[in-house]
């Protein structure tokens, strides 16, 4: 049986489990989803500001289905994607297409996940198989992080969300199995 067999309202997402601070350094590397990949102009402050709290970050809402093997959530889950741009809070409204960009100068900042929330998701499986569950970590908020010149692209890998996590039926979690990451066939639904 194909996915047509399932109705959109067949399963509900179990309420989120709560929020967690920045996860341990074991996020899967391949879970980048389609966020701005550290792209665009390097976000820099036109005036010298040393306090990262003065910077703000773009938080984009992103929805995707959670999958595990052939099983898929009946409804997509929503989380935040932290865009690659950071800027002075007074210049960077939290919305796309508004506000002014500034010229690069000064330290490099990146917009990265700050807090995660854990959510248990029920999955429907084809062929009349019993439903399964998976715990997924979803980005709940973003923050600006100042990078030194020693940070390189490989060190930015853990800025990706876990959302695209591989397929373990897990509770959201930072995980150290990068290989599993490319497994989760995520379907992005905007």
């Amino acid at each position: 049986q194909g996915w047509q067999a399932f109705k959109n309202d067949a399963t509900e997402i179990i309420p989120e489990l709560g929020e967690y601070p920045e996860p341990p350094p074991e996020l899967e590397n391949n879970k980048t989803m389609n966020r701005a990949e550290n792209g665009g102009r390097p976000p820099h402050h036109p005036f010298e500001t040393k306090d990262v709290s003065e910077y703000s970050c773009r938080e984009l809402h992103f929805t995707r289905y959670v999958t595990d093997g052939p099983c898929r959530s009946a409804k997509p889950v929503t989380e935040l994607v932290c865009s690659g741009q950071c800027g002075p809070a007074r210049l960077l409204p939290n919305a796309i297409g508004r506000g002014k960009w500034w010229r690069p100068s000064g330290p490099d900042f990146r917009c990265i996940p700050d807090r995660y929330r854990a959510q248990r998701v029920q999955l429907l499986c084809p062929g009349g198989e019993a439903p399964r569950a998976r715990k997924v970590r979803l980005v709940a908020s973003c923050k600006c992080k100042r990078l030194t010149r020693f940070h390189n692209q490989s060190e930015l890998k853990d800025f990706g969300t876990e959302a695209a996590r591989p397929q373990k039926g897990r509770k959201p979690r930072p995980r150290a199995r990068s290989a599993k990451a490319n497994q989760a066939e995520l379907e992005n639904a905007y």
């Epitope: 489990l17 709560g18 967690y20 996860p23 341990p24 074991e26 595990d68 093997g69 052939p70 854990a118 248990r120 499986c125 062929g127 198989e129 019993a130 399964r132 569950a133 998976r134 715990k135 997924v136 970590r137 397929q167 373990k168 039926g169 897990r170 509770k171 959201p172 979690r173 930072p174 995980r175 150290a176 199995r177 599993k180 497994q183």
Partner: antibody
Framework: EVQLQQSGAELVRPGALVKLSCKAS????????IHWVKQRPEQGLEWIGR????????IYDPKFQGKAIITADTSSNTAYLQLSSLTSEDTAVYYC?????????????WGQGTTVTVSS | DIQMNQSPSSLSASLGDTITITCHAS??????LSWYQQKPGNIPKLLIY???NLHTGVPSRFSGSGSGTGFTLTISSLQPEDIATYYC?????????FGGGTKLELK
């Protein structure tokens, strides 16, 4: 770094009870299911059961029902396995492991194991 | 309960050989099949999950295949560090069950 640190070896008398611990670091146990697996000397792996630390829900292999009780304390990020009415058949290494899907199709990190020896 | 029958129970091979271990489930387990490696005196480690996906850090000489009830773990170009006991495990339904293990030794 993800780690599951298990309590030390236990030497116990037949009929006694023992409680093993499995302390997680590098991740929150509420984000996973925690499983316990038994391995008798020179034998294979036997699944005992699992807990969802978020709500305390447990599932056991019927063979271990009445023998094992799995609990978790999310405040200390620790899972526990209690074994009662111990006999020589319970002499084994007991492992905890984490898994993020249910039923657990893969356990990606394991504790170092706790050896339980039942002897009079 | 789903029974997992693993064969052979022991296997002798030479370095550089390609070896195959099979696991047969008593009923359809879809893709919910993992393989673990346990070296002597060590803990089990996840090698492969969902039939064919390599866990982080596992060398590409390990591969898994199969579907439904029949599954295979293949190690190509056997290395000294591959000497271990290998277990399959089904995650289709509770209770979870493991195969009896295949002890791999050097000839």
């Amino acid at each position: 770094e993800v780690q599951l640190q298990q309590s030390g070896a236990e030497l116990v008398r037949p009929g006694a009870l023992v409680k093993l611990s499995c302390k997680a670091s590098g991740f929150n146990i509420k984000d996973y299911y925690i499983h316990w697996v038994k391995q008798r000397p020179e034998q294979g792996l036997e699944w005992i059961g699992r807990i969802d630390p978020e709500n305390g829900n447990t599932i056991y292999d019927p063979k271990f029902q009445g023998k094992a009780i799995i609990t978790a304390d999310t405040s200390s990020n620790t899972a526990y396995l209690q074994l009662s009415s111990l006999t020589s058949e319970d002499t084994a290494v007991y492992y905890c492991a984490r898994c993020d899907n249910d039923p657990g199709s893969e356990m990606d990190y394991w504790g170092q194991g706790t050896t339980v020896t039942v002897s009079s | 309960d789903i029974q997992m029958n693993q064969s052979p129970s022991s296997l002798s091979a030479s370095l550089g050989d390609t070896i195959t271990i099979t696991c047969h489930a008593s009923q359809n387990i879809n893709v919910w099949l993992s393989w673990y490696q346990q070296k002597p005196g060590n803990i089990p480690k996840l090698l492969i999950y969902k039939v064919s996906n390599l866990h982080t850090g596992v060398p590409s000489r390990f591969s898994g295949s199969g579907s439904g009830t029949g599954f295979t773990l293949t190690i190509s170009s056997l290395q000294p560090e591959d000497i271990a006991t290998y277990y399959c495990q089904q995650g289709q339904s509770y209770p979870l069950t493991f195969g009896g293990g295949t002890k791999l030794e050097l000839k």
